[in-house]
């Protein structure tokens, strides 16, 4: 499918200053658009709340690793 022309871009302008428990996290997505001022991660919580986080922070990287592992197809 072709990209939408002038599709809206989600950006993060501020990051959470609190570490979020991985048990509260459901998924994440990256914000890498050059239209945004900051490289960012948006976590979606189990109650569908979206939270901006700083990908340079260790807890953010560890949380992404944890969520990635949950997508792993079990070996039979």
């Amino acid at each position: 499918q072709p990209d939408a022309i002038n599709a809206p871009v989600t950006c993060c302008y501020n990051f959470t200053n609190r570490k979020i428990s991985v048990q509260r996290l459901a998924s994440y997505r990256r914000i890498t658009s050059s239209k945004c001022p900051k490289e960012a991660v948006i976590f979606k919580t189990i109650v569908a709340k979206e939270i901006c986080a700083d990908p340079k922070q260790k807890w953010v990287q560890d949380s992404m690793d944890h969520l990635d592992k949950q997508t792993q197809t079990p070996k039979t």
Epitope: K56, M64, D65, L67, D68, K69, T71, T73
Partner: nanobody
Framework: EVQLVESGGGLVQAGGSLRLSCAAS????????MAWFRQTPGKEREFVTL????????DYTDSVKGRFTISRDNAKNTVYLQMNSLKPEDTAVYYC????????????????WGQGTQVTVSS
Amino acid sequence: EVQLVESGGGLVQAGGSLRLSCAASGGTFSSYRMAWFRQTPGKEREFVTLISRSGGTTDYTDSVKGRFTISRDNAKNTVYLQMNSLKPEDTAVYYCAAAGSMGWNHFREYDYWGQGTQVTVSS
């Protein structure tokens, strides 16, 4: 925008070793899951191995387990692939890939790719 540059490929005899390197620039390297894939003419890109952001988790395709080792140096923005006991069937173009998106080992889950480095194993 992450740029990836592979090096270290070449021609080696069966049973030999090679070490591939992939240097990253343009992003927070330690925030990307890194992987190596390989491709032979007419075939889909095949997962070889991956390493988590922390380096604490790795995964390998069955055919390279015990022979290949992936590692990363987040201070040097580099991921490595040590390839031992090489076989002719390891001949391929090897690609380094970085994933910002959630996922594991499917090539469509990887956002950034290097240009590839040729590995040829002769019998």
